[in-house]
Amino acid sequence: GLECDGKVNICCKKQFFVSFKDIGWNDWIIAPSGYHANYCEGECPSHIAGTSGSSLSFHSTVINHYRMRGHSPFANLKSCCVPTKLRPMSMLYYDDGQNIIKKDIQNMIVEECGCS
C-alpha cells in the first residue's frame, strides 16, 4: 500500500492522529491519550484497481477486470479507496463498574489502503 506524499492522487494511506480528548472519550479511555488511526484517500482508476497488489482482495481484482471491459453488471461500479490491512491496538479503559479493563481492540489502525 502507498503512503500519501502529496505528489499523487491515487489511493494511499494518509497519516491521521486521533486524540480521544478531541472526541470526548478521555473520560472513559485511560490510555493511550490518542493514536495514529490513519485513513485512506485517493482515486482508484481502472488500471490501479485491477492490479492485485493494490486491491482489497483477489476478488476485487477479478471484478475490476470485468469492470474495465465494460461487462454488466459491473460497468458502472466505482472502485473505492478503502483499508486493506488493519491492526489491533491495546486500550485501557473504565467499564460500567469503574473497573480498569485492558483489551486488544481489533481494526483500530489503518496500515494499508487499496482499491475495492
Epitope: 485511560i30 490510555a31 493511550p32 493514536y35 489491533p88 491496538m89 491495546s90 485501557l92 480498569i100 485492558k102
Partner: antibody, heavy 123, light 108 residues
C-alpha cells in the same frame, strides 16, 4: 508459550563493541514495542532502550545515548542491541522484554521478560 | 525525566503479615504506574499495571492503589514465596521509562 531468549553477551574490553540479540516466539512480535532493560550486579533495574512495533518510535536512556542502537527485524521475530564504546559501567545482566500494550506509538511497561544475557566490560 | 522513589528501601516481615510498599513520582503520572517482583537470579515479573490492575495469574493478595504522585503496593497476607525485591515503574512520560530503586522484602 510466550518466550524471549537473549544471546550475544560476553566479556569485552572497554571501548569495544558487542551486539545482543533477542529471539521472540509465542506472540505476534510485530504488534508490540520491545525493550532492553539492564541490571548491574547487586543493583536495581535500569531501562536501556525501547523500540515501537513499527520502529517509528525509539528511545534511549541518557547513559547509553549515542553509543547504543536498538533495532528489530519483524520478519525474523528478533530484537537487537548494538553496543559501541563500551564502558565498565555497562557491565550488567541485559534483559529483553515485551511491552504490555499492542501497537502503541510509545512505551508502557513489560509483561514478558527473557532470562537475560551477561555483559562484562573489563580489561 | 520523572524520578521514582520507593520506601522503604528494605523491610522485614513475617509470613501472614500485611505489607505496604510506597512509590512516589517526582510529578503527577496519573495512573501510569506498574509494579514488578523480582526474586534472586530470576527475571522480573509484572504484578500490577495501571496502578491497580492485577496482571493475569498474579494472586489476589497483591493489590495496587494510588493516582497522581503517590502509589502503594499491598500484600494482604505474606506468603513464603513473596520474599523478593519489588520495583515500581512509571510510563506516563516515555521515553525514558523509569524504575524506582527497589524495595527488598526480607523474612523477619
Amino acid at each position: 508459550e510466550v518466550q524471549l531468549v537473549e544471546s550475544g553477551g560476553g566479556l569485552v574490553q572497554p571501548g569495544r563493541s558487542l551486539r545482543l540479540s533477542c529471539a521472540a516466539s509465542g506472540f505476534t512480535f510485530d504488534d508490540y514495542a520491545m525493550h532492553w532493560v539492564r541490571q548491574a550486579p547487586g543493583k536495581g533495574l535500569e531501562w536501556v532502550s525501547g523500540i515501537s512495533w513499527n520502529s517509528g518510535s525509539i528511545g534511549y536512556a541518557d547513559s547509553v545515548k549515542g553509543r547504543f542502537t536498538i533495532s528489530r527485524d519483524n520478519a525474523k521475530n528478533s530484537l537487537y542491541l548494538q553496543m559501541n564504546s563500551l564502558r565498565a559501567e555497562d557491565t550488567a545482566l541485559y534483559y529483553c522484554a515485551k511491552d504490555i500494550m499492542g501497537n502503541w506509538d510509545y512505551f508502557y511497561g513489560m509483561d514478558v521478560w527473557g532470562q537475560g544475557t551477561t555483559v562484562t566490560v573489563s580489561s | 525525566d520523572i524520578q521514582m522513589t520507593q520506601s522503604p528501601s528494605s523491610l522485614s516481615a513475617s509470613v501472614g503479615d500485611r505489607v505496604t510498599i510506597t512509590c512516589r513520582a517526582s510529578q503527577s503520572i496519573s495512573s501510569y504506574l506498574n509494579w514488578y517482583q523480582q526474586k534472586p537470579g530470576k527475571a522480573p515479573k509484572l504484578l500490577i499495571y495501571a496502578a491497580s490492575s492485577l496482571q493475569s495469574g498474579v494472586p489476589s493478595r497483591f493489590s495496587g492503589s494510588g493516582s497522581g504522585t503517590d502509589f502503594t503496593l499491598t500484600i494482604s497476607s505474606l506468603q513464603p514465596e513473596d520474599f523478593a525485591t519489588y520495583y515500581c515503574q512509571q510510563s506516563y512520560s516515555t521515553p525514558p521509562i523509569t524504575f524506582g530503586q527497589g524495595t527488598r522484602l526480607e523474612i523477619k
